[in-house]
């Protein structure tokens, strides 16, 4: 497959962003434990991003083990949690705003912000540097814009779109009008490659937003950031996505990117989409 072909892959809504899980234990490897029973169980596979069957020995193991496929999906897949595009009028919070803070399983602590549904405000927490969930923001402002209510009970702002003049990429931007057209790419695609804190040399890929391509780098094995993919295809799929267009009933339409310049009409504004 050429990069051109990969770029035109249409991603389904249920696809997980890389290294962003609803619970850290969903990233654990299937562990049959030391006992010798033969019990059919399910675990979440972070590489296929699906719940799969495995044989459990009956004792010990880890939390990435579920009695049923449904329970596994409920705990570890994001069918609902990643549908951040809501109907225009409702302006609801994204579902991930209601997830509890999750520092993840690494220990390269950095200050991040999450929306605390108990206090109805964004708060600081220590993020371990990997995994965790999407209720995780680099700045207080970003957290407030996405998850906090304004004084009238509505969102402070809702996602919008801006064409970045520097690198021709679309980045989320707060808009005062309900936008019908949005970029659904994860914000971490715009972060630089980060080797992390350990001493391994694993082959990984990161999205270079300046040149708009996925490039290899050596990962240390822990820490770093979410712009970290095990394959080039996974990197392209996550960071070079198409747009998502709202329709009145909250449904989603995926549109592929075109190479030639294309004008997109929006209810409140016009933007140009160029060779992304």
């Amino acid at each position: 497959d050429s990069e051109e072909d990969e770029e035109h892959t249409i991603i389904t809504d249920t696809e997980l962003p890389p290294l962003k899980l609803m619970h850290s234990f969903c990233a654990f490897k299937a562990d049959d434990g030391p006992c010798k029973a033969i019990m059919k169980r399910f675990f979440f596979n972070i590489f296929t991003r699906q719940c799969e069957e495995f044989i459990y020995g009956g004792c010990e193991g880890n939390q990435n083990r579920f009695e049923s496929l449904e329970e596994c999906k409920k705990m570890c897949t994001r069918d609902n949690a990643n549908r951040i595009i809501k109907t225009t009028l409702q302006q609801e919070k994204p579902d991930f705003c209601f997830l509890e803070e999750d520092p993840g399983i690494c220990r390269g602590y950095i200050t991040r912000y999450f929306y605390n549904n108990q206090t109805k405000q964004c708060e600081r927490f220590k993020y371990g540097g990997c995994l965790g969930n999407m209720n995780n923001f680099e700045t207080l402002e970003e957290c407030k814009n996405i998850c906090e209510d304004g004084p009238n009970g509505f969102q402070v702002d809702n996602y919008g779109t801006q064409l970045n003049a520097v690198n021709n990429s679309l980045t989320p931007q707060s808009t005062k009008v309900p936008s019908l057209f949005e970029f659904h790419g994860p914000s971490w695609c715009l972060t630089p490659a980060d080797r992390g804190l350990c001493r391994a040399n694993e082959n990984r890929f990161y999205y270079n937003s300046v040149i708009g391509k996925c490039r290899p780098f050596k990962y240390s094995g822990c820490g770093g950031n979410e712009n970290n993919f095990t394959s080039k295809q996974e990197c392209l799929r996550a960071c070079k996505k198409g747009f998502i267009q709202r329709i009145s009933k909250g449904g989603l339409i995926k549109t592929k990117r075109k190479r030639k310049k294309q004008r997109v009409k929006i209810a409140y504004e016009e933007i140009f989409v160029k060779n992304m």
Epitope: E100, R107, Y109, Q118, K120, K126, G128
Partner: antibody, heavy 116, light 108 residues
């Protein structure tokens, strides 16, 4: 200068009520605020907290259902209504600002004694 | 909620380094703060967010936090540092604020 001044403490019988006030001066008191108490010769204990606009309140299990925290931002004042008081509520009560979930400004404290 | 454990007392000679520990389950994954309280006075924040010093707090006060233990270090301890010291942390899940039991620092 930035300061918090508590008032309203005193002697009260078990089962009685008391209302503490905390007046802020030198700054706009619109951030999270809290009450912390200290029994004689003991350590600090967080009692209750309230958001800047008063819409969210939180309580330690030991006072839940008996104490009510509130604020009047137009008067720059924080309150603690204490009902059904018990001997173990005897303490110095401090009000404190905790904008980033650490207490950076404290009052001088007001003593509440619950005794018959 | 997390429980924070401190030694009841620590003694140090003037000019020496005093270290006060505060332990709690995975405390390193939370922000730890330290307060100084002298007899008859309100507490004063001396370290916030593990290792940051508020303005007006002398440089001899420092803090660290990793694993299960946060540590307040006072280098070149002076007589005026004699006080009770409390560690604390905030638990977002229950929106509660937890204090350690306090450590009495005696400057010999």
């Amino acid at each position: 200068q930035v300061q918090l001044v508590e008032s309203g403490g005193g002697l009260v019988q078990p089962g009685g009520s008391l209302r503490l006030s905390c007046a802020a001066s030198g700054f706009t008191f619109s951030s999270y605020a809290s009450w912390v108490r200290q029994a004689p010769g003991k350590g600090l204990e967080w009692v209750s907290g309230i958001s800047g606009d008063g819409s969210n309140t939180h309580y330690a299990d030991s006072v839940k259902g008996r104490f009510t925290i509130s604020r009047d931002n137009s008067k720059n004042t924080l309150y603690l209504q204490m009902n059904s008081l018990r001997a173990e509520d005897t303490a110095v009560y401090y009000c404190a600002r905790y904008d980033n979930f650490y207490f950076d400004v404290w009052g001088q404290g007001t003593l509440v004694t619950v005794s018959s | 909620d997390i429980e924070l454990t401190q030694p009841p007392s620590v003694s140090v000679a003037p000019g020496q380094t005093a270290r006060i520990s505060c332990s709690g389950d995975s405390l390193g994954s939370k922000f730890a703060h330290w307060y100084q309280q002298k007899p008859g006075q309100a507490p004063v924040l001396v370290i916030y967010d593990d290792s940051n010093r508020p303005s007006g707090i002398p440089e001899r006060f420092s803090g660290s936090n990793s694993g299960n233990t946060a540590t307040l270090t006072i280098s070149g301890t002076q007589a005026e540092d004699e006080a009770d010291y409390y560690c604390s942390t905030y638990t977002s899940r229950s929106h509660s604020y937890v204090f350690g039991g306090g450590t009495k620092l005696t400057v010999l």
